[in-house]
Every structure is written in C-alpha cells, then in structure tokens.
Interface confidence: medium
Amino acid sequence: QLPPGKPEIFKCRSPNKETFTCWWRPGTDGGLPTNYSLTYHREGETLMHECPDYITGGPNSCHFGKQYTSMWRTYIMMVNATNQMGSSFSDELYVDVTYIVQPDPPLELAVEVKQPEDRKPYLWIKWSPPTLIDLKTGWFTLLYEIRLKPEKAAEWEIHFAGQQTEFKILSLHPGQKYLVQVRCKPDHGYWSAWSPATFIQIPSDFTMNDEQKLISEEDLGGEQKLISEEDLHHHHHH
C-alpha cells in the first residue's frame, strides 16, 4: 500500500469562451481508495478555490460554469490525489480560456453541383457557424476548412476557406460520389470535429477544368478574377 501516483491534467476545452472543462488522468491508486480534488487560483491572486463542479464533465473532470469563467483572467490549477498513505500533486496547468476554445462542428452543410450554361460547372458548398458561437460580438473569428473525397478514395483533399461560409470547387472527377465535410476553429483555439459527411453525386458530364478558370463576378461575389489551380486547391497539411 502506497501513496497515490502523480495525476496529470491532460486537457481543458471550452465550447464558446463562456464555460470550460478540464480533465485529469489519475496516477496509480497505491491499492487504496483515492480522493481527487482540483484547486485553482487566478493570475495575480493567491487565494485558492476548489473546483466548482466535479459532475458535469464526467469522471476525473472539473467544469467551470458561466459564473466561474472569465475570458480576461488566467487560471492556474492543479489536482491533489489523497489516500490513507499520503498525497501527490499534479504539475500546475495554466489555462487561458481564449486559447482552449474547441467549437462544435459547423451546421447545415449543403452541397450542390452548379452547371451554368456559359461557364464550367462547379461544386458549391455552404454551411453555418455552430450555434454556441456568437460571431456578432466580435469576440470570435472562425476559420473554416473543407475536406472532400470520392467515396472509395483513401485520401482527402483539404481546402482552406478562411472566414467564408461558402466555397466553390471546380476540379472534380465526373461520375463519382463525393463525401464533403467542414470544420472550424477560432483564431487561437482548436479545430472542431468534422461535421457529419454530406454526399453528392457528380454528374458524368461534369467536365474537368483547364489549367486556369475564369470565374465570374456573381460566383465570387466580387470583381472578376482569374483563379489558378494553386489558388483553388489551397492545400493545408496537418
């Protein structure tokens, strides 16, 4: 029978900067019942507080509700493991809520094949930001990535959409069924999970593009612009 092993706070996440949750991994239990407590203080303070909610986030977690969450303060926290033989402490973790936001995936993903008479066909993808994120306040800038692949292909093609909530893709394989997904991240935070896949059948007469494409004003929502393959296939490797 031994004192407990050192726990580790391994993850903190916030869906929207208004609440956040941290999770820890217990160390060895020393063969005895072990109690865990998370204590924290805010930067510039020495007064320690105990975790306000050990339930909401599930086992080995601490949830900070709205009244305990401040974007403008940083939190310094640690976990104490105690059994009859003694105690051990995790390393401290510094948490700035701005940096740990992991939004829900974007919503309402819609995919359409557009085949204008006078121009090359293209795939039009549109989505909405996740509901928990309030973009109107200016606290958030969300960036988006799209990935797509033919149903039976192994490799995803990834496009960076910036802050746009719609995107056009021109080079696709005719006759193939494509899976399309989108995800988002705030400036300083983590990528969301990918949205559920939307399937789209590319018609057999969807012609492959020339090396450069002329996209018109209506499509771009701006001035007429010549877009190269490189621009259209802005690949990001992760």
Epitope: I9, F10, K11, C12, E43, T46, I76, F89, D91, E92, L93, Y94, V95, D96, Y99, I100, H188, G189, Y190
Partner: antibody, heavy 120, light 113 residues
Framework: EVQLLESGGGLVQPGGTLRLSCAAS????????MSWVRQAPGKGLEWVSS????????YYADSVKGRFTISRDNSKNTLFLLMNSLRAEDTAAYYC?????????????WGQGTLVTVSS | DIVMTQSPDSLTVSLGARTTINCQSS????????????LAWYQQKPGLPPKLLIY???TRESGVPDRFSGSGSGTDFTLTISSLQAEDVAIYYC?????????FGQGTKLEIN
C-alpha cells in the same frame, strides 16, 4: 517592488563548497517557484536548478545533479543553493530568479547576481 | 534535452528599423492540454540581469513597450522589434520552459549602426 538579493559568492578552490542565499521581498515568496540560473563570463544563460512551491519538487541540470542542492525557507523569504564539489566550469554569475507562477514558467524577476569563482 | 537555436548570432540594424530574431526548438514546445507554447524571450543589457519581455511565446510582460512582439508555434518562434530604439541594444535570449532541463538559446547580440 519585487527585490531579489543574492549573497554568498566568492573565490573557492576546486572541490570546495559554497552556499548561496537569495533574500526575496516585495511579493508573497511562498506562492512562487524559484530558480537559480548562471552565466559564465562572456557566455550565455544556463539554467541550474528550480524549486516549486511545494519544497519537495526540485529540479536540476545534469551538470550539477548530485553536487548542488536547492532549498527554500518560506518563513524567512529566502532561497538557497548549496554547492559541493565545485569545479572550474562552475565559475559564473549566479542569478536568483522568480518564476511567474507556482511552477517554473518563465522567470519574471531576476536578482543582480553573485559571482562564484572556482580556481586554485 | 530540448535544444534552442537562435539566429542570427548578431545583428546590426539602423534606428527605427524593424528587427526580427528567430528561435527554433529541437522538439515542439506547444502543449496540447492548454494550447500554449512554453517559450519566453529575455533582454539582457551589459552588466545587468536578464529581463523578461515575452512569455507563452506571444504574451508581452507588463511594462514592456509594445514595439516588442513574439510569434510562432510548435518549434519556430520570432521576436520582433517593430521600430528599433537606441535603448534596445542588448543580447536577446529565448528559453523553453516546457521540460526540464529548461534551456536557453545561445543569444543574439543586437547593435545599432
């Protein structure tokens, strides 16, 4: 105003012992990790040792492990570095540094340093 | 051990010029638990102890002029001085505090021409 004042440096022969002290004021000493960082004449900075708020958590550079011991007396707001089996390569200015937090996360205040010279 | 490599070793720049110093770590110092890079930048003037400028790779220490900024993530970091002043002549060090032993870059000496 945060102040860190090192003392205890001087000339010592190889194999000798010195004990450095760092008197802290202007902040809640017991709430912050503390460290020793050294700088050989004309050279860069080298981290030596750190001690967290809980005095049992001590860390050492490989070059001093087994020879140097860091400790703190929170009641006297003082940090110590006991240096045994000193070598010529330990010659340096030794700085006492306050960590930004209770663990060792960046050093936001430094003392003026105390010079240790190991020479026969 | 994590090795920190700064470039250049020395730099001579005109007053008012934009200046950048680079720092590379031999392994990532970005922690997935809190999305922070465990990197600090220090300024050391002749005969004085080092002074903390930037921590968490991009957070400016209070009282540090806003012409100093830090950027980068993972293994590649930059200290930028937007408009060099005479009082910025010093040696600049980066330091990782991700893992012990905490290690410093070799320093970059900044001078004015």
């Amino acid at each position: 105003e945060v102040q860190l004042l090192e003392s205890g440096g001087g000339l010592v022969q190889p194999g000798g012992t010195l004990r450095l002290s760092c008197a802290a004021s202007g902040f809640t000493f017991s709430a912050y990790a503390m460290s020793w960082v050294r700088q050989a004449p004309g050279k860069g900075l080298e981290w030596v040792s750190s001690i967290n708020v809980r005095a049992g958590d001590t860390y050492y550079a490989d070059s001093v492990k087994g020879r140097f011991t860091i400790s703190r007396d929170n009641s006297k707001n003082t940090l110590f570095l006991l240096m045994n089996s000193l070598r010529a390569e330990d010659t340096a200015a030794y700085y006492c540094a306050k960590a930004r937090y209770s663990s060792n996360w960046g050093f936001d205040f430094w003392g003026q340093g105390t010079l240790v010279t190991v020479s026969s | 051990d994590i090795v920190m490599t700064q470039s250049p070793d020395s730099l001579t720049v005109s007053l008012g010029a934009r200046t950048t110093i680079n720092c590379q770590s031999s392994q990532t110092i970005l922690h997935s638990s809190n999305n922070h890079n465990y990197l600090a930048w220090y300024q050391q003037k002749p005969g004085l102890p080092p002074k903390l400028l930037i921590y968490w790779s991009s957070t400016r220490e209070s009282g540090v002029p806003d012409r100093f900024s830090g950027s980068g993530s993972g293994t590649d970091f930059t200290l930028t001085i937007s408009s060099l002043q005479a009082e910025d002549v010093a040696i600049y060090y980066c330091q990782q505090y991700s893992n012990t032993p905490y290690t410093f870059g070799q320093g970059t000496k900044l001078e004015i021409n």
